[in-house]
């Protein structure tokens, strides 16, 4: 005989991203005997729920809750059962249920009442479900980035913890509700508000980050309908050929369309809008998003936020993938430079309805907002943020990085179930290459 | 209110090409909506043909777009569908309507559903020698 | 092409009783968390019309009885409480992806 040596045990953990739009489940998985090892904790499986958001069931909050059933049975097949009661759940809302909260607390409270009623149902270890702030979106959404590329510490061949020489990769998110952009800084924030100071492996990290509320793609989208129907008979954002029936109570029902919207109007009344394929003034209802006016640090990067110069490489996920990657496949425009990426955003711009479907087949309505997408994320990233060439030439479009999603949901549940300590691991402590 | 009438012949013979056309009162078919055609097959569901928009773009089903043409008539608020090399398969009831992208919100997202809202009373085609 | 499957072919059910259509999607016709689906109800010798739009909201004018529900490839049409006028085959339709595609009906009649 002679022994077989068995697989390392695995531990799991479950996170529901409940998005403005819908709801991701991820399940992410590791070796119990190498849990504070960097870059171990993987994605086992995901699952979207079907719907929308959890913030769409305001009327209805017991839906919020039934609408995750089926990804939670899948939950229940995808971890072995012997796992079940040791698995952590959790359940992280974004800005589409701040918005909600914003607007009518009770019904944001019923909804999470209602979605934690659903998942104390099951046989993991629940851990609670609850409004992430904009600023946790940001670091968490850092973390998951840098974790899974292992630029916290490294495993050396002598058995010992290092910190690598290459920096902090910065990060940049763009939901369908809010936007967040995190990246390590030297200098202290003149901001106290946009500054997080964390300790990871030994290691210690100044972290400017910011989240813009109203920023994310859907809203963008809806204030630019909103200010279209303000300022033109027309949108120049849509396509020649494109034409619809606009609701107006659609139009101005979310907090982020308030400033366009007329002190009296007909919410039920339905206008036509078409479409007029024109870069320029598109270019001009999105420059409108962003003001410029008054700074009161040194310097900002849009509406009187502190920023400072973004600094080192950038990765840009979720939305900013998607628009820049409909760009480059479904498109086949080059986008490697800023001057590129505004080349491609007027291209789009300039397509007809007509043009845009033969050029996409299959597609439908979605086509129609991609030349405000890819307008918003150009004058978003430069005029925004501040990226010149030079530091754009720094910035990977990614969703996912070894073989897991990027966003805010890994780096939350490493947080919260001690994955990544505030020191190294003693036994194994190695020189400090800084 | 807006009203659509299909007219046209009611036999055409195979190989021939089969001409319709849908008169549109009470709207201009150059300020808005998607002008279609569609056909019902007897005893089957609904088959759509395609489209000649506001702007008078065109839009074909790719299971027919070789035999398919859609055009239209502005001073007679007309459109009409071409359908050449017609066989006996092409029987069937066919519709004009109208359609748009009615903007809705789902999930604080704006959403663009394509329906077709006003429709004719149809007009049956027969292909036979 | 998205190909829509409806479910029962025909339905016969008493007045003040509940109606379920069902429509199956070849695959999903979701984006985004919304529902690219509508739903078309066609009298015997009349054209068409529209019920139901983005798989739950109700066309005005359309009686309350009515509902839609679902997401991603399933999705069904509720009468909750079914009236002799209501006899008349339904059509589920797509919109999600080119070229719009309608099931092939389910005919619903009044015992």
């Known amino acids: 005989t002679r022994d077989i040596r068995e697989p390392p045990a695995l531990k799991y953990g479950i996170v529901l991203d409940a998005g403005s739009s819908h709801t991701s489940m991820f399940i992410y998985k590791w070796p119990a005997d190498k849990e504070n090892d960097t870059g171990i904790v993987g994605q086992h499986s995901s699952c979207d729920v079907p719907g929308g958001g959890i913030s769409s069931y305001a009327d209805n909050p017991s839906g919020a809750g039934q609408s995750l059933v089926g990804c939670l049975e899948q939950a229940l097949r995808d971890v072995p059962k012997e796992r079940h009661a040791g698995t952590p759940l959790y359940l992280g809302a974004t800005a589409g249920m701040r918005l909600l909260n914003l607007t009518n607390p009770e019904a944001s409270t019923s909804v999470l009442t209602a979605v934690t009623h659903t998942l104390t149902q099951y046989p993991f270890d629940f851990r609670g479900a609850r409004i992430l702030s904009g600023q946790e979106e940001g670091v968490f959404g850092w973390v998951t980035a840098n974790y899974l590329l292992e630029n916290f510490i490294k495993y050396g061949w002598v058995g010992r913890w290092f910190r690598p020489r290459k920096g902090t990769l910065g990060a940049m998110d763009l939901g369908g509700a809010s936007t967040q952009i995190t990246f390590e800084t030297t200098s202290p924030a003149e901001d106290r508000a946009s500054e997080v100071q964390l300790r990871l492996y030994g290691q210690h990290y100044r972290v400017y980050t910011h989240s813009f509320l109203c920023y994310g793609r859907d809203q963008v989208l809806q204030r630019l309908l909103a200010s279209a129907l303000q300022t033109h008979s027309f949108h120049p954002c849509w396509p020649r050929g494109f034409s619809t029936h606009v609701l107006l109570g659609d139009v101005y029902q979310s907090p982020c369309t308030v400033a366009q919207r007329p002190q009296t109007f007909n919410s039920s009344a339905r206008v036509s809008l078409s479409g007029s394929s024109d870069p320029h003034l598109c270019r001009d209802l999105v420059s409108g998003l962003f003001s410029f006016s008054s700074c009161p640090f040194s310097r900002c990067s849009f509406n009187g936020v502190f920023q400072p110069p973004v600094a080192g490489n950038f990765i840009a996920f979720s939305a900013f993938f998607y628009t820049v990657n409909f760009l480059r496949t479904s498109m086949g425009l080059p986008v490697a430079t800023l001057q590129q990426l505004e080349a491609a955003a007027v291209n789009v711009c300039n397509q007809t309805w007509a043009q845009l479907q033969a050029r996409v087949p299959g597609q439908q309505a979605h086509l129609a907002d991609y030349c405000a997408g890819a307008m918003f994320v150009q004058q978003l990233l430069s005029r925004g943020y501040g990226f010149d060439e030079r530091a754009f030439g720094g910035v990977i479009f990614q969703k996912k990085a070894a073989d897991t999603a990027v966003g805010w949901a890994l780096g939350y549940m490493l947080n919260l179930t001690n994955l990544i300590p505030a020191d190294p691991p003693g036994l194994r402590k190695g020189t400090d290459f800084s | 209110q807006i009203q659509l009438q299909e007219s046209g012949p009611g036999l055409v013979k195979p190989s021939q090409t089969l001409s319709l056309t849908c008169t549109v009162s009470?709207?201009?078919?150059?300020?808005?909506?998607?002008w279609n055609w569609i056909r019902q097959h007897p005893g089957k569901g609904l088959e759509w043909i395609g489209y000649?928009?506001?702007?008078?773009?065109?839009n074909y089903n790719p299971s027919l777009k070789n035999r398919v043409t859609i055009s239209r008539d502005t001073s007679k608020n007309q459109f009409s569908l071409k359908l050449s090399s017609v066989t006996a398969a092409d029987t069937a009831v066919y519709y004009c309507a109208g359609g748009y992208y009615r903007y809705g919100l789902g999930s604080y997202r704006g959403s663009y559903y394509y329906v077709m809202d006003y429709w004719g009373q149809g007009t049956t085609v027969t292909v036979s020698s | 092409e998205t190909v829509l499957t409806q479910s029962p072919a025909t339905l016969s059910v008493s007045p003040g009783e509940r109606a379920t259509i069902s429509c199956k999607a070849s695959q999903s016709v979701d984006y985004d968390g919304n529902s690219y689906m509508n739903w078309y109800q066609q009298k015997p010798g009349q054209a068409p019309r529209l019920l139901i739009y983005?798989?739950?909201n109700l066309e005005s004018g359309i009686p309350a009885r009515f509902s839609g529900s679902g997401s991603g490839t399933d999705f069904t049409l509720t009468i909750s409480s079914v009236e002799p006028e209501d006899a008349a085959t339904y059509y589920c339709?797509?919109?999600?992806?080119?070229?719009?595609?309608f099931g092939g009906g389910t005919k619903l009649e009044i015992k």
């Open positions: 983005a798989a739950s």
């Open positions: 000649i928009s506001y702007d008078a773009d065109n």
């Open positions: 339709q797509q919109s999600n992806e080119d070229p719009p595609t």
């Open positions: 009470g709207y201009s078919i150059t300020s808005g909506y998607y």
